[in-house]
Amino acid sequence: YYGCPSECTCSRASQVECTGARIVAMPTPLPWNAMSLQVVNTHITELPENLFLNISALIALKMEKNELSTIMPGAFRNLGSLRYLSLANNKLRMLPIRVFQDVNNLESLLLSNNQLVQIQPAQFSQFSNLRELQLHGNNLESIPEEAFDHLVGLTKLNLGRNSFTHLSPRLFQHLGNLQVLRLHENRLSDIPMGTFDALGNLQELALQENQIGTLSPGLFHNNRNLQRLYLSNNHISQLPPGIFMQLPQLNKLTLFGNSLRELSPGVFGPMPNLRELWLYNNHITSLADNTFSHLNQLQVLILSHNQLTYISPGAFNGLTNLRELSLHTNALQDLDSNVFRSLANLQNISLQSNRLRQLPGSIFANVNGLTTIQLQNNNLENLPLGIFDHLVNLCELRLYDNPWRCDSDILPLHNWLLLNRARLGTDTLPVCSSPANVRGQSLVIININFPGPSVQGPETPEVPSYPDTPSYPDTTSVSSTTEITSAVDDYTDLTTIEATDDRNTWGMTEAQSG
């Protein structure tokens, strides 16, 4: 094919691929009709000038994962047809100021994952057709405020994984067509008011993994087309009133891994398209009434790994389409009987690793579609009669790692569990913690004899009376052999369904980092 270099492969479609560590300089001669050239995983360290003079038809040049550290001025001369240029994953520390002057029809320029320490003001001045600029994964600490002034056609700009500590409020003022802006994994501590005001077409804004402490109240007010907003893993301690009021198109919002202590009612303004809200790993201590009332299409709400001690009965008002609620790993001791009343479509609820001592009998009264309830690792000693009776879809109930008190009051729960054992899964069943004569025995299969004294085991140290547990000598193997005396129909029989155990860190859904 017009003299394909031996180190390369050339296709009839005018595509040339050169790869391999043995390549230390650009192979020559390259086919004059080449339209796509890929030079990947080589040991090429520099691009001299006039390198591509004889392949002026080139549209795409991909030079990735090489050892490039030097590009001479004029290296891209005669590539006026080039639309796509990738120099990603090389070792470029600086770029000559006019290095791109011969490729002014570029639509995509990828400079990511190099070692660039600065961008010159005029570096991108001729790129009026540029749609995509990738600068992530470099060592940039600042960018001249006029650097992007001429990129009026830009739709995607990635500045993530650099070392920016601040942004000029006018940096993006000419980027009215921008749809995706990524600033994640930098060192931004605050973002000046007005920084995003010109970005009326922005659909995605990635600010996660910075050091942002405060958000200006009107920071996003001009971004009415925003669909995805990533604010996770920052130092945000509060959300200003109205911060999200002008975001009617938002469908993804991540706020996990911040320092939020409270959520004022209405802070999540009308967002009819928001499906998921990730708030885990904050310091939220309580939830007020109507905190989420504008989010009537929300399906997933993750509040795990906070410090919740109180949830107001109306906190979840308006969440009529919620499917999954994760409240695990908090400090909840008690729940109001009406707290889940408005969650008519809830399917999964995770309440494990709290301090729940008891549950109201009607806690799940209006939540008829529940399929999964995680209550493991709490302080539960018993559960009210009939608490699960109406949950005909329940197929996974986790009750282990609770200090169940297996006295006469446990019989209704015991009987229900006998009839619905498959709902508990197969690997981990709840066991009795007290009295001492039945400690360690399965709550499901234990035989309990009432009335009568506890069966005493051999002498062992007194068990501490923490909390609300009488002191009984501890035994490891004493079993009671007498029969259950109460009726089995204290709990209504439910259709048994096999359940599997899945111990996900954040709840029922894998956490997404944005």
């Epitope: 310091h283 201590t285 790994h305 410090q307 001690t309 790993t329 400090a331 001791q333 494990q352 690793s353 301090r355 493991q376 690792n377 709490n378 302080n379 986790r398 282990y400 790692d401 609770n402 200090p403 981990t428 066991v431 009795c432 913690s433 400690r439 360690g440 062992t460 140290p461 068990v463 501490p464 923490y466 909390p467 547990t469 501890d474 035994t475 490891t476 111990r503």
Partner: antibody, heavy 121, light 107 residues
Amino acid sequence: QVQLLESGGGLVQPGGSLRLSCAASGFTFSTFAMSWVRQAPGKGLDWVSVISGTGGSTFYTDSVKGRFTISRDNSENTLYLEMNSLRAEDTAVYFCAKAVTVNTRGFFDYWGQGTLVTVSS
Amino acid sequence: IVLTQSPSSLSASVGDRVTITCRTSQVIRNDLGWYQQKPGKAPKLLIYDASSLQSGVPSRFSGSGSGTDFTLTISSLQPEDFATYYCLQDNNYPWTFGQGTKVAIKR
């Protein structure tokens, strides 16, 4: 009589690994959460990790997350701490401790005597 | 959550009333315990849930407080009480200890 006996400590180079064990007796092991607490020489107490009675819930202090793994074998009445990518600042006496309940609480009524882990080149 | 004990050390005589405070950087309800440790020994649980006396611990030990401010009181110091005392919060992961308060014999 409740007894907790730690083992597995010793001298290890930075980046190395150790596995601590804690053999428990005298109580119904599976019905109590267990924890590891460490104490650097001449310093205060530092909570490391906790595991619930079944082993279904585990938690760690931030500095060991991703490096240490707590586990338990309820059939053998043994608690473990797998320690990888060890650093000099992990040097301490490591105590295993029995919680007062099956769920993860920070109240420990019985403690072992500790095993010394030294991380040094 | 940061726990700050005060004082860091104190000297007292047998029979004295001793008070040690523990302040938390965030509200932790009553999810706090107190431990005693003697040199070369493992710690010993004295108080759980801020004010509940652990079984077998002498009644001269008492705990109080809720929210962010907690107190351990020894009503009448005994010779065996000379030790270092630590508070521990288990309201929020990671659980954290205070830096300790050393109670020494007044010379």
